[in-house]
Interface confidence: medium
Amino acid sequence: KSSNEATNITPKHNMKAFLDELKAENIKKFLYNFTQIPHLAGTEQNFQLAKQIQSQWKEFGLDSVELAHYDVLLSYPNKTHPNYISIINEDGNEIFNTSLFEPPPPGYENVSDIVPPFSAFSPQGMPEGDLVYVNYARTEDFFKLERDMKINCSGKIVIARYGKVFRGNKVKNAQLAGAKGVILYSDPADYFAPGVKSYPDGWNLPGGGVQRGNILNLNGAGDPLTPGYPANEYAYRRGIAEAVGLPSIPVHPIGYYDAQKLLEKMGGSAPPDSSWRGSLKVPYNVGPGFTGNFSTQKVKMHIHSTNEVTRIYNVIGTLRGAVEPDRYVILGGHRDSWVFGGIDPQSGAAVVHEIVRSFGTLKKEGWRPRRTILFASWDAEEFGLLGSTEWAEENSRLLQERGVAYINADSSIEGNYTLRVDCTPLMYSLVHNLTKELKSPDEGFEGKSLYESWTKKSPSPEFSGMPRISKLGSGNDFEVFFQRLGIASGRARYTKNWETNKFSGYPLYHSVYETYELVEKFYDPMFKYHLTVAQVRGGMVFELANSIVLPFDCRDYAVVLRKYADKIYSISMKHPQEMKTYSVSFDSLFSAVKNFTEIASKFSERLQDFDKSNPIVLRMMNDQLMFLERAFIDPLGLPDRPFYRHVIYAPSSHNKYAGESFPGIYDALFDIESKVDPSKAWGEVKRQIYVAAFTVQAAAETLSEVA
């Protein structure tokens, strides 16, 4: 049967019917419902929400909706022994203590089970010592401290401002520098936009607000006790000493009122330049230790959190495909939140809920997608992408054979300026074509397409008249699908004006003030941006599941491969003498990219011409498209990161949130001038070029005519 015979409705009508069924008012209602109490991973409240979503997805019309549970390592503060930081005098008396909780927002004063701010997976400990201010605690910040300023962090407690990079990278860098504790704080320079009031009168962070978050360095492992395998009822668990990615020093987050008290007394070295100064009225001295009058005072951390194996629940809904039920298009986003989850994740979960409802409505009218659509409500994303990773580990054999695409659906908004898309190059044309068909919600773009407003507000740096699309990094649930399994992935949300707003993320991220009211009053009162994101995410899923030929363009991969090869070559060419000495050549990589480009071009020509009424040939061509992303997977993984297996993209070793191209070569070249054995270091560069060239060539050959 052709797709149309199987689905009874013309394809164009299907897409329009699906999009027209999506309603802003429903998303608003769902967001309200999901944000009235906290839904922390591993709690009864989040289990109840999982069962509610299961029940509603069944009502909406999905074929089946199941809970998938796992027993994973989570982390919680001790309810009777709170975490805090003090300044102690020479007698050991606590002369200042940081706050034990955030002042609750209006209307939420009587809500129970608000977890106080903490750094998930911090070990217990009560270190005391001198403070060193380390800016954002990035790799380059520690280079500045240690190499240029000759400041030793060994045995010190470091204080770092949130922003720029994933907090787990900050903690890893501090550990490597020898620190014995880490204090993380939100500086107004990064979390308070000028001219905007703090919550509840605006969307800025108040002084008592604190960002929660995990501080793991999992590198894609999932549950720290069962790397590579699902944390099921018969799992073999590692001992805590062998667990993956746990920090070894105590860590705790604070707000800027408390940070002021710690930073105002800092002495020692002045900040090296203006980029180390935030917006507090303090000198931003680096230390170590306090100035003159306060030099005998120390900082002491009191951390009593515990790591506990706890049950988590994913909700997995299935809408069976009519023609290719063994091909899966997945829409997934997480359900667990740090507190109310007004933006993260429930602005995304509400959109997924409405997408499921719309698909269900079409199904009740007799329609089915060509391919199977799986919907997922992931648990324990905030604790290290645990729910999605465990489910993918349990189902890896099915996914690697049947997975067409994964669309992520965490926070729908991080601003209300323009669209932001990160995806595989295979999806560029899909995103372009879809956004040309959608209406822009932006003021001043009435009657114009989303593509037009997006392109105007966020132009591509390389191609005039096209919008910017970024590389996938990590820090969200697409990680296991893309970086480990090689399933084509993408994500979309509305974002802020990156060019004019210098703060990191959105100010109230992971704080108690991330409420329904934050969204309804300040970000999206009409829920028009949420609706647009629903149309983009839902539209992508619809096309991926329903188009007869998969909407992937392999030529776009060829273009970026050339760009990435140019980039990594020019990084290497900063060392021309060593390149010559060690006979380092990129010829094999450029040759492979050239071959890929030619073969992709020929494949695209065949794709236009083949007989689409022949189901065997159609399936063959689609399989070549589906398996192209898979072809970039190296089964051995990247050095010391076995679960990051994609050779073209990986999360940056210096910032989990950012994507790095040709990561194996990039990491081999990073700081190579400081390596003690240059011959060995350049040998590794050559090996990584070989791996990359081989992989690109092998991927190209999957697009060649099969016989």
Partner: nanobody, 119 residues
Framework: QVQLQESGPGLVKPSQTLSLTCTVS??????????WSWVRQHPGKGLEWIGF???????HYNPSLKSRVTISVDTSKNQFSLKLNSVTAADTAVYYC???????????RGQGTLVTVSS
């Protein structure tokens, strides 16, 4: 730490050519993967992208300004430049040079320089 500094005349006569230079310190302008761009902000308005030069030398301009704009680079001086000819009062704006890249975190901008077009 990379820093960018714009320089050039603050006042330009109508029909003449506006010329600005951006000096990059703390990093090489030929660093791979970066785009060196010019943007401007008219009084009370949002940012308008003018154009950029990619590290490998390819140049892209805003279509609406393309006929009047030239962006060039001098790697030996670690500078890149903007020329906008046939200016009118509508070109009065704060002009910024910036560094961009594939990813959102790559964006850096200079302090900006006000250019007034007036006789």
């Amino acid at each position: 730490q990379v820093q960018l500094q714009e320089s050039g005349p603050g006042l330009v006569k109508p029909s003449q050519t506006l010329s600005l230079t951006c000096t990059v310190s703390g990093g090489s302008i030929s660093n791979s993967g970066y785009y060196w761009s010019w943007v401007r902000q008219h009084p009370g308005k949002g940012l308008e992208w003018i154009g950029f030069i990619y590290y490998n030398g390819s140049i892209h301009y805003n279509p609406s300004l393309k006929s009047r704009v030239t962006i060039s680079v001098d790697t030996s001086k670690n500078q890149f430049s903007l020329k906008l000819n046939s200016v009118t009062a509508a070109d009065t704006a704060v002009y910024y040079c910036a560094r961009d890249g594939d990813d959102y975190g790559d964006y850096l901008r200079g302090q900006g320089t006000l250019v007034t077009v007036s006789s």
